[in-house]
């Protein structure tokens, strides 16, 4: 196939580009280049006549183009306006021509960029900062780097002005970083020097560590306060509202129950004049307390809610343990323990997560267990199941249907027959049924907590005679050696025997045939074309018997390796060549011919009148089955001899 390769594809202004032609056909009259994606006399650049070796300029010729005998086009001293598509039109004869399109893009060389900023010391949660990458350059891509990484995704970061401007809205301390911009085009890339953003912030609400609030008598109390702040904060401590000291740490040795109370840390930022405080309540115990479990959600919804179970109280230097169903925690991506093991989080709870859950506090002597906690997980209703599964009943028997749908709280049930409400019970009982009881039986399950309802519909047939069965199939057009087909005999009936016939005969013994589901289902594995037969199913009980209409399996296969006829390969000059190609295939394949690799016609028969030695060569028949997606081919060599030069040659068709 004729193709154009641009070398290079992206061209710098002032340089040159070669539009290189590949697979140029033989025996040409000439060729012509056009600006754009199509042949257009008004946009011809240059033409070349092979016989006279003459180049003829066209309306789009600029004097910078050189055409070569191999049809390639060199464009020198490239300008911006040269960007775009170029079409080569190869002229053979009588408009049986070929064309191909290539393209290239023109870009300028870029200078080193720099960053300008509208605010050098922004205040957190108040100011915005706009960085602009200079200079503005046409056809350039602007990129930004934060700490030498690409920009994070954030609603506070906005690129505008063709990505030239980076705006940080409501700056935060995390925006304190090194910023660089980069200009790029396909022929060059330049990066600016870095600009450091210094954000003033804080103080935040101070954090008092350690976090535990329960201590044993006789321990040392050592509290540390920290508040994120720029510039750094100054700290003060208060115990039960009374000022203690202006330090970042508070130390009280050998505490007693009397040291219980509220401990306040105050952080102050001298630049902003802002103060923030945090209070922690410290409890000093004489003995370790019995643990108990608190939950953030007492009635979680399945597949929606997460539940966090916390072991109370919080005690310093204590090991927390957990048990589920009286066993240690299983490994599960849905179970997460906090760093101190005090909080157990169940992500996306399921109905199986009810528990019970226990936590324990380990001390030097023993492990204290909490009381067990059971989760009440709300779920369902699932799709109701109506049992038994029979759809066919004889008159006179009792009809007893039961409905069940998994649900918490338990589902409320309603029965409808042919759309009419019957009763609000889980079971439906009708004694001594008749044909009039045939119909659509609907069970509706409702969860009062979620308000969700689910229904299942079952068709019940009451008849003395067995109905005429039918065959359902899971695949109407299986592909040979690839697909399996499962036939099911409908309907499912009580106290019924199911039978199968293939082409009027009972089932052959074959490892590819399998009966299941009480002989109701017949599965054919790895179907073959020989399985394209008539399949019949039958049902019988003590009263009656019936057979389905036959179902014929339409197996898609092929195409097989084609056969070219007649088999002759030697012909006399002047004879007619009449080759026919055939391949077994379902559906029928599409045929095409190639002579010496050149595509011919899409027909089953190839006819050439009065052949000559010029017709020597390889004749290939290609077959394609669109349904199976498979292809096949065969090649035949044909030799044509001049009349009378070789005895015994075929005269042709």
């Amino acid at each position: 196939k004729l193709t154009i390769e641009s070398t290079p594809f992206n061209v710098a202004e002032g340089k040159e580009v070669l539009l290189l032609v590949h697979n140029l056909p033989q025996h040409l009259f000439g060729y012509s280049w056009y600006k754009g994606e199509r042949v257009d006399g008004n946009r011809q650049i240059i033409g070349y006549v092979i016989g006279t070796q003459q180049a003829t300029p066209g309306p789009a010729y600029s004097g910078r183009e050189i055409i070569y005998p191999n049809a390639s086009l060199l464009i020198q001293n490239i300008i911006q306006n040269d960007t775009g598509f170029y079409t080569l039109h190869v002229i053979k004869s009588d408009l049986v021509n070929e064309e191909a399109t290539g393209q290239f893009r023109v870009y300028p060389e870029l200078p080193k960029p720099s960053i300008s900023s509208n605010n050098s010391k922004p205040v957190e949660d108040k100011d915005a900062v706009a960085f602009t990458c200079e200079p503005e350059t046409q056809d350039a891509t602007y990129l930004w780097w934060v700490n030498n990484q690409s920009l994070p995704v954030s609603p506070r970061l906005q690129l505008s002005n063709g990505n030239r401007t980076l705006t940080l809205f409501n700056v935060t301390r995390n925006d304190t970083a090194s910023y660089k911009c980069e200009t790029q085009n396909p022929v060059s890339a330049r990066r600016s020097d870095s600009v450091i953003l210094n954000v003033l912030y804080g103080p935040d609400a101070p954090t008092i560590s350690p976090l535990n609030t329960s201590y044993r008598s006789g321990e040392n109390l050592n509290l540390s306060c920290h508040a994120a702040s720029n510039p750094p904060a100054q700290y003060s401590w208060f115990v039960n509202g009374t000022f203690q000291q202006s330090t970042q740490e508070l130390f009280i040795p050998n505490i007693t129950v009397n040291n219980s109370g509220s401990y306040t840390c105050q952080a102050h930022n001298s630049d902003t004049g802002l103060n923030r405080t945090t209070v922690t309540t410290i409890t000093v115990y004489a003995e370790p307390p019995k643990p108990f479990i608190t939950s953030n959600n007492s009635n979680p919804v399945e597949d929606e809610d997460a539940v966090a179970l916390t072991c109370e109280p919080e005690i310093q230097n204590t090991t927390y343990l957990w048990w589920v169903n009286n066993q240690s925690l299983p490994v599960s991506p849905r179970l997460q323990l906090s760093n101190d093991n005090r909080t157990l989080t169940l992500l996306s709870v399921t109905r199986n997560d009810v528990g019970p859950y226990e936590c324990g506090i380990q001390n030097e002597l023993s492990v204290d267990h909490s009381d067990p906690v059971i989760l009440n997980v709300l779920y369902g209703p699932d799709d109701p199941t109506i049992s038994p599964s029979y759809t066919y009943y004889r008159p006179g028997v009792n009809l007893s249907l039961s409905c069940h749908a998994a649900s918490n709280p338990p589902a409320q049930y309603s029965w409808l027959i042919d759309g009419n409400i019957q009763q609000h019970t889980q079971e439906l009982f009708i004694s001594n049924i008749t044909e009039k009881n045939s119909g659509l039986y609907t069970c509706q399950a409702n969860n009062s907590a979620s308000g969700h309802s689910r229904t299942t519909v079952k068709t019940i047939t009451v008849s003395a005679e067995l109905p005429k069965p039918s065959i359902s199939s899971n695949n109407s057009k299986p592909v040979e050696d690839k697909d399996a087909v499962a036939f099911t005999c409908e309907p499912e009936a009580q106290n019924t025997t199911y039978l199968w016939w293939v082409n009027g005969q009972s089932l052959p013994v074959s490892p590819r045939l399998q009966l299941s589901n009480g002989n109701r289902t017949l599965t054919l594995f790895n179907v073959t074309r020989n399985d394209a037969r008539a399949y019949v199913c039958g049902i019988q009980n003590s009263v009656s018997a019936n057979r389905s209409d036959p179902v014929t399996l339409d197996v898609l296969y092929g195409p097989d390796t084609p056969i070219i006829s007649p088999p002759d390969s030697s012909y006399l000059s002047g004879a007619n060549l009449n080759l026919s190609c055939h391949s077994a295939s379902n559906p029928s394949p599409q045929y095409s011919w190639r002579i010496n690799g050149i595509p011919q016609q899409h027909t089953q028969v190839l006819f050439i009148a009065k052949i000559t030695p010029n017709n020597n060569g390889t004749y290939a028949c290609f077959v394609s089955n669109l349904a199976t997606g498979r292809n096949n081919s065969i090649v035949k060599s044909i030799t044509v001899s001049a009349s009378g030069t070789s005895p015994g040659l075929s005269a042709g068709a």
């Epitope: 009259f29 000439g30 012509s32 199509r38 042949v39 257009d40 006399g41 008004n42 011809q44 033409g47 006549v49 003829t56 300029p57 066209g58 309306p59 010729y61 039109h89 002229i91 009588d94 408009l95 049986v96 021509n97 064309e99």
Partner: antibody
Framework: QVQLVQSGAEVKKPGASVKVSCKAS????????MHWVRQAPGQGLEWMGR????????NYNQKFKGRVTMTVDTSTSTVYMELSSLRSEDTAVYYC?????????WGQGTLVTVSS | AIRMTQSPSSFSASTGDRVTITCKAS??????VAWYQQKPGKAPKALIY???YRYSGVPSRFSGSGSGTDFTLTISSLQSEDFATYFC????????FGQGTKLEIK
């Protein structure tokens, strides 16, 4: 071989419209511009415009803008030229043509007579 | 729009004569000019492209020359089948034809 077959002669009253068809065969229909050229009796050739069958892109002679519409039906490889608000000076033979570097093909022409 | 002015509008000549037809463009069109021959009741037939190059199958007695705004079609030795109307055409900016030169038998 390349053939451009045009529709038959038409007689129209002033103010009416005429639609001439040009059915192409023997080449890749969507590769080349189709031009329309007219020739009044005893007069020279006048280029009316062109259409590209691949995307129905058109260029019209300013003289005919607003009166001429060129369309294409790729399913039948046919190009149409419709001229509206006909006047007596529109009486001419209308040709469709493929005119490119080193080759040209013309239809047989369609005589349109405008007479009251 | 570019105008193409052709001269003469008609010309009488004899078989064997050398005939020259000229065409002038209203602006520079480079060498983007073609010449056509038309016989009565027939569609035009292209003779010359790019001002001076013969189409395949056109006899060598037909030649073209010129560039910019002035163009010439020359028939070196008139044959009986050459009596027809000749048109120049520019394809530098869309398409414009000259008004034609009718070549008649003297």
């Amino acid at each position: 071989q390349v053939q451009l077959v045009q529709s038959g002669a038409e007689v129209k009253k002033p103010g009416a419209s005429v639609k001439v068809s040009c059915k192409a065969s023997g080449y890749t229909f969507t590769s080349y511009w189709m031009h329309w050229v007219r020739q009044a009796p005893g007069q020279g050739l006048e280029w009316m415009g062109r259409i590209h069958p691949s995307d129905s892109d058109t260029n019209y002679n300013q003289k005919f803008k607003g009166r001429v519409t060129m369309t294409v039906d790729t399913s039948t490889s046919t190009v149409y030229m419709e001229l509206s608000s006909l006047r007596s000076e529109d009486t001419a033979v209308y040709y469709c043509a493929i005119v490119e570097w080193m080759f040209d093909y013309w239809g047989q022409g369609t005589l349109v007579t405008v007479s009251s | 729009a570019i105008r193409m002015t052709q001269s003469p509008s008609s010309f009488s000549a004899s078989t064997g004569d050398r005939v020259t037809i000229t065409c002038k463009a209203s602006q520079n069109v480079g060498t983007n000019v073609a010449w056509y021959q038309q016989k009565p009741g027939k569609a035009p037939k292209a003779l010359i492209y790019s001002a001076s190059y013969r189409y395949s199958g056109v006899p060598s007695r037909f030649s073209g020359s010129g560039s910019g705004t002035d163009f010439t079609l020359t028939i070196s030795s008139l044959q009986s089948e050459d009596f027809a109307t000749y048109f120049c055409q520019q394809y530098y900016s869309y398409f414009t034809f000259g008004q034609g030169t009718k070549l008649e038998i003297k």
